[in-house]
Interface confidence: low
């Protein structure tokens, strides 16, 4: 601690602040009657250099002048930018055991003169705000540097503020604390920034501006919207603005959108009518303001107003499909299905659907409302029936969509030809077909319908379907398609009053089945063996099964087994074989094959035919 300097003094020439690259002479002098006791000649003055409180050099060899026992002068060079501490110590050479005693110290600051400040920019936020200016100070000076911001204007207006930069804080912005009012709109103002430190001073070029150049209006606030007559597409946006605002920019978008609708409004006076909104849609609105049509700056965007437009009655056509099942000789069950409207068609929350089933001669009409997307009724098998469905929200209902109820697979001449199903990737299947060969009436549309081939799927799950125009012969089905599951796919050709269909199975991805079929029984009838089995559990099929294989060989034989390959049919669970010898014991088992390969074998059963073999 060199706070007192009782033993002597330290001085610096030319000054304790020097430009980068300059040398300095540091003199250390003992006060009278100070020094090593009784032996002035043994006084040795040493100079130590510290950077960041760490001793970095003993300047013993830099002595340029020495009054033995009284004072010494050292030359220091190559000082780095910033502050360096030098401490002079007294070393009494006759007493080796005592450490050197601090005499005094000095800090030398190395820096540069300030550059002229540049890029002055001034703003006043709002009509009631104050003028604040910022600038670029240029290179770091490494010295305490004072900055003065001066403003002058009409009617002898002058104003100035000061701040400083050092190693702890940076000064490149000042708020003058004065307000420029709109009545000075045409007046010119001049600002200048002056920088001064111990090594020099510099001044910026004068920067001239007008009120309009620097005043940035406050963003609009208190934004709200009124929907005219509860309209979902027209609304009046209202807001509060500063009094001098003449131009507004409005931007608005649905919340899930990525592009804004932009509108410029002149002299809006806090109100603007919007006419192109989408009903029942979450919107975000923001507004910006400007004080002058040509000059000046836009305000920041206001805080967002987020709101949902009111509902309007649904538009669009429901996509309807149906299933027919005969119950007995004079009754049939009709199950109607439809897809939900998309939001732009629903234009609100769909509260219910109005369903009508009508015999075309108008003898019988069944009507109901439901909140579901399906409806089932039992009707007579006689007569020609038509169905219609419309969707309703709080504002009204969509136009009803009609469909004729025909026998979907009743006309062989309308059955599409060469139906194929190819897996495209993990989650879709490409279905292609050829038109019916000898249709006696024009195909109005195709319907591609699919359903997972799992137990109970007809009753548990509604079908999935796609409507295809009559000139298209392919469909890529992806809704609810999962890998390793077999789907039954039907292509329906519909005319005005008839339907024909063809069916195929398909999967989007397949593996060999996990297990083989389980043989449940082997029975002998009329010199033929009937093999009965249970199908592989649905999760273990891993795609569409193409064939079953029945293998057999004589027990204890090492020969290759014989096999019989049968086309997979879901309804079939037994098959005859007739090439086994009587009174020979055989081992039999089964496997299943998908497009990816064969399953492991199922259970083995032994059987010894008794009858006469062919």
């Amino acid at each position: 601690n060199i706070d007192v300097c009782k033993l002597g003094t330290v001085t610096v020439q030319p000054a304790p602040v020097i430009p980068l690259g300059s040398a300095a002479n540091i003199s250390c002098s003992l006060n009278p009657k100070q020094g090593c006791s009784h032996y002035p000649s043994s006084n040795e003055l040493i100079l130590l250099k510290f950077v960041n409180d760490v001793l970095v050099e003993n300047l013993h060899g830099k002595k340029v002048h020495d009054h033995t026992g009284h004072s010494s002068t050292f030359q220091v060079t190559n000082l780095s930018l910033g502050m360096t501490l030098f401490v002079c110590k007294l070393n009494c050479s006759n007493s080796q055991k005592k450490p050197p005693v601090p005499v005094c110290g000095v800090e030398i600051s190395v820096g540069v003169a300030p550059e002229p400040p540049q890029n002055i920019s001034c703003v006043q936020e709002g009509e009631n705000g104050t003028v604040a200016c910022s600038w670029n100070s240029g290179k770091v000076t490494y010295l305490k540097t004072n900055y003065t911001l001066q403003l002058s204007g009409p009617n002898n207006l002058t104003c100035q503020k000061q701040c400083f930069s050092d190693n702890r804080q940076n000064c490149n912005r000042l708020d003058l604390g004065i307000n420029l009012s709109p009545d000075l709109a045409e007046s010119r103002f001049i600002v200048r920034v002056t920088a001064i430190n111990d090594l020099g001073n510099s001044s910026s070029l004068p920067h001239t501006f007008t009120f309009l150049d620097i005043v940035i209006p406050l963003p609009p606030w208190d934004i709200r919207i009124n929907f005219l007559n509860a309209s979902g597409s027209r609304g009046t946006l209202q807001w509060e603005d500063e009094g001098q605002v003449v131009l507004n920019q409005l931007r608005y978008q649905p919340l899930n959108s990525t592009s804004w609708n932009m509108v410029n409004a002149t002299n809006a006076k806090g109100k603007y009518d919007l006419r192109d909104l989408r009903p029942f849609t979450e919107y975000e609105f923001q507004i910006s303001s400007k004080l002058h049509l040509s000059g000046g700056s836009w305000s920041n965007w206001s805080e967002s107003l987020r709101t949902r437009t009111p509902e309007e009655e649904p538009v669009g056509i429901l996509d309807i499909w149906y299933m027919k099942q005969d119950i007995d000789y004079d009754r049939q069950q009709i199950s109607l299905f439809w897809k939900s409207l998309n939001p732009s068609e629903a234009r609100g929350k769909i509260l219910h659907y109005q369903v009508t089933l009508q015999e075309v001669t108008k003898k019988t009409t069944l009507q109901n409302t439901t909140r579901h997307t399906s409806w089932t009724r039992v009707i007579p098998r006689t007569g020609a029936w038509t169905a219609s469905v419309s969707a309703a929200n709080s504002k009204g209902a969509s136009a009803p969509t009609h469909i004729n109820i025909v026998d979907l697979c009743g006309t062989g001449l309308l059955a599409p030809h060469q139906v194929s199903a190819k897996s495209e990737n993990m989650d879709n299947i490409l279905v292609t077909w050829q038109p019916p060969k000898k249709a006696d009436s024009a195909v109005r549309e195709y319907i591609v319908e699919w359903r997972a081939l799992q137990p109970g799927s007809i009753t548990k799950f509604p079908p999935h379907w796609l409507r295809i125009p009559p000139d298209n012969m392919s469909a890529l089905i992806s809704e609810n398609i999962k890998p390793y599951i077999c789907y039954e796919i039907r292509v329906h050709a519909l005319s005005e009053s008839q339907g024909g269909c063809s069916s195929i199975r398909g999967d989007s991805k397949h593996k060999a089945p996990v297990s083989g079929p389980h043989i449940t029984a082997i029975t002998e009838k009329k010199e033929r063996l009937f093999i009965s089995w249970t199908h592989i559990p649905f999760p273990e099929q891993r795609g569409c099964i193409l064939h079953y294989r029945i293998y057999w060989k004589e027990r204890d034989s090492t020969a290759q087994p014989e096999l019989c390959e049968i086309q997979y049919r879901r309804s079939q669970n037994s098959h005859p074989i007739s090439s086994l010898q009587p009174r020979v014991t055989y081992v039999l088992w089964m496997t299943a094959v998908t497009a990816a390969g064969e399953s492991p074998q199922g259970n083995e059963r032994e059987f010894c035919p008794q009858g006469k073999a062919n």
């Epitope: 606030w221 208190d222 709200r224 919207i225 009124n226 209202q238 509060e240 107003l305 709101t307």
Partner: nanobody, 119 residues
Framework: QVQLQESGGGLVQAGGSLRLSCAPS????????MGWFRQAPGKEREVVAT????????YYADSVKGRFTISRNNAKNTAYLQMNNLRPDDTAVYYC????????????WGQGTQVTVSS
């Protein structure tokens, strides 16, 4: 439904002060934007001052700027209009109004309180 009850009106000399209060009931006050309006005899109702639900934004008619202050205390469920340096042309029935911050005009209105400034 929101009910609004104004209080604090009365007769005052020109240059005097009054403080109007408005206490909504029936729903959460802190989500309502509030406003003060006035209607002088034979004139249309005009906005005096408004305050956003958070209190962060205020608006004043030019005729009351610097004299009137709108504020709110969400903890006390009350909105205020502090009126200083009152002038005879401030004489009117003063109405408190509230609206949902989401959107819309001022949906809820009080019965009004009479402010009379004598010269």
């Amino acid at each position: 439904q929101v009910q609004l009850q104004e209080s604090g009106g009365g007769l005052v000399q020109a240059g005097g002060s009054l403080r109007l209060s408005c206490a909504p009931s029936g729903r959460t006050f802190s989500t309502l934007a509030m406003g003060w309006f006035r209607q002088a005899p034979g004139k249309e109702r005009e906005v005096v001052a408004t305050i956003s639900w958070s209190g962060g934004r205020t608006y004043y008619a030019d005729s009351v700027k610097g004299r009137f202050t709108i504020s709110r205390n969400n903890a006390k469920n009350t909105a205020y209009l502090q009126m200083n340096n009152l002038r005879p042309d401030d004489t009117a029935v003063y109405y408190c109004a509230a609206r949902e911050t989401d959107y819309g005009a001022y949906d809820y209105w009080g019965q009004g309180t009479q402010v009379t400034v004598s010269s």
